[in-house]
């Protein structure tokens, strides 16, 4: 008579986390008499998964009735699979012995792999802000998924992007995988309210993709435009000059007034007006006592935005001839003539 063989027909079984795994095992003979056991792993450290004879195995059920006469099917089902259940499962036949049963023959083993969901995608933007018309890179990372097949898409304000590069690691077979993608995005002035989205689809997600987002407000710097104008004044010996700082982002802004190159006043923007596109406006004014000046005055509005190099706009405030002759008696307003920026 042929010696008993332990047949584990599947070399590997793949199951999604949370599902049940069926591990198949069959004997070719009823002899020798003795129980079968299932183990995870081999050697002294192996874990007992199921013992036909005795024990408590709450997650394990047998596929067929083992006590039935002539039963040769010793397949089991393990419920509520988690990644920690991965490993090689061995169906082992024992020969009845005294005082202990003796291991007789083992199956070749069935590798249980667990289909695992990708982690929530983490999107990160550039370390430093860039100005409109420049290209910035965003990265998206997700880890721990299995199997390897995965789809990643990038969107900007709902529109799919095409300029990106994606890698899935490792290249060979593994228990789980990671994905890394870099998208290149050209900034526009209106991007303060824009968002980039990294979307990941995987078999374990059952059609409900994972999304990671990043706000372009963290990546963009819109430099201000400056306009210096003179406002009408009732008092003859005063000129009110305003500096309109427009369409800048982010908020951080410091403005310095200079009279003939000398610092007159420095202030930090506080009460800002927000535009629809997310940029800000701010206005600063300077009262100039014209009677204190015998000659024309060059007024400079100098703005330092978001730690960048200062930009400025200068205007020449012309002191009229009457003012130059009569000082405070002059009643004509000073004339304002623009000059090229310094």
């Amino acid at each position: 008579e042929d010696e008993l063989q332990v047949i584990q027909p599947e070399k590997s079984v793949s199951v999604a986390a949370g599902e049940s795994a069926t591990l198949r095992c069959a004997m070719t003979s009823l002899i020798p008499v003795g129980p079968i056991m299932w183990f995870r792993g081999a050697g002294a450290g192996r874990e007992l998964i199921y013992n036909q004879k005795e024990g408590h195995f709450p997650r394990v059920t047998t596929v067929s009735e083992l006590t039935k006469r002539n039963n040769l099917d010793f397949s089991i089902s393990i419920s509520n699979i988690t990644p920690a259940d991965a490993g090689t499962y061995y169906c082992v036949k024992f020969r009845k012995g005294s005082p202990d049963d003796v291991e007789f023959k083992s199956g070749a083993g069935t590798e249980l792999s667990v289909r695992a969901k990708p982690s929530a995608p983490v999107v990160s933007g550039p370390a430093v802000r860039a100005t409109p018309e420049h290209t910035v890179s965003f990265t998206c990372e997700s880890h721990g998924f299995s199997p390897r097949d995965i789809t990643l898409k990038w969107f900007k304000n709902g529109n799919e992007l095409s300029d990106f590069q994606t890698n899935v690691d490792p290249a060979g077979d593994s228990v789980s995988y990671s994905i890394h993608s870099t998208a290149r995005v050209v900034l526009t002035r209106g991007d303060v309210h824009s968002q980039v989205i990294c979307e990941i689809a995987h078999i374990t997600l059952q059609g409900d993709p994972l999304r990671g987002t990043a706000n372009l407000s963290e990546a963009i710097r819109v430099p201000p435009t400056l306009e210096v104008t003179q406002q009408p004044m009732r008092a003859e010996n005063q000129a009110n000059v305003t500096c309109q700082v427009s369409n800048f982002y982010p908020r951080g802004l410091q403005l310095t007034w200079l009279e003939n190159g000398n610092v007159s006043r420095t202030e930090t923007a506080s009460t800002l007006i927000e535009n629809k596109d997310g940029t800000y406006n701010w206005m600063s004014w300077l009262l100039v006592n014209t009677c204190a000046h015998r000659d024309d005055v060059v007024l400079t509005c100098q703005v330092e935005h978001d730690g960048q190099q200062a930009v400025s706009k200068s205007y020449a405030l012309e002191i009229s001839a009457h003012q130059k002759e009569h000082g405070s008696d002059i009643t004509h307003e000073a004339a304002l003539a623009p000059t090229a920026p310094l």
Epitope: G43, A44, G45, E47, L48, G55, H56, A84, S174, V175
Partner: antibody, heavy 118, light 114 residues
Framework: QVQLVESGGGVVQPGRSLRLSCVAS????????MHWVRQAPGKGLEWVAV????????DHVDSVKGRFTISRDNSKNTLYLQMNSLRAEDTAVYYC???????????WGQGTLVTVSS | DIVLTQSPDSLAVSLGERATINCKSS????????????LAWYQQKPGQPPKLLIY???IRESGVPDRFSGSGSGTDFTLTISSLQAEDVAVYYC??????????FGQGTKVEIK
Amino acid sequence: QVQLVESGGGVVQPGRSLRLSCVASGFIFSNYGMHWVRQAPGKGLEWVAVISYDGRNEDHVDSVKGRFTISRDNSKNTLYLQMNSLRAEDTAVYYCAKGSGSYYFDYWGQGTLVTVSS
Amino acid sequence: DIVLTQSPDSLAVSLGERATINCKSSQTVLNSSNNKNYLAWYQQKPGQPPKLLIYWASIRESGVPDRFSGSGSGTDFTLTISSLQAEDVAVYYCQQYYNTPPWTFGQGTKVEIK
């Protein structure tokens, strides 16, 4: 939840014996291989011994073979390490660890300190 | 026996920055029959026992924050902490379970805050 509580450590002279115990709870003790791992003061981890789920098979690191014996009592959910002929180099914190399959160690006890000194 | 060598022995990283620990094995721990890498990573905080972080080289243990990730195959492996937090200060060990007994560990890498 899984808990492993070691006891039996202390100060002992070279050549003497000590028996460590580890009481397990929160899992079916009799289904798992169990291990002892030690850590000398300021040093790394060193695996010491393993015992099978039923206590019938065991193995030890070469440096303790013939001196240390791992055993278990499944009726008491307890793992033991009998340490004989102790040496100064056996001074360490001894951890009891639950095996996950024949693979990695998924739970560890807090450890018990054994000091071998004259 | 399989020897695991970690590098660096210690590293100081600023909060929020990435920390990378390498583990090199003297022989492969990749089982070609099932394409599994038999490697785990543990974290040991001062005065505490080791805690399992990663197994099968890349699977995060339940409850481990996803800033921890494992990668690599064959003989070269990496543990990455993507954004270091104050509570991540610890010694990290790799361990092989491919060729056992004995189960062997790397010498450990100490991670501190810069």
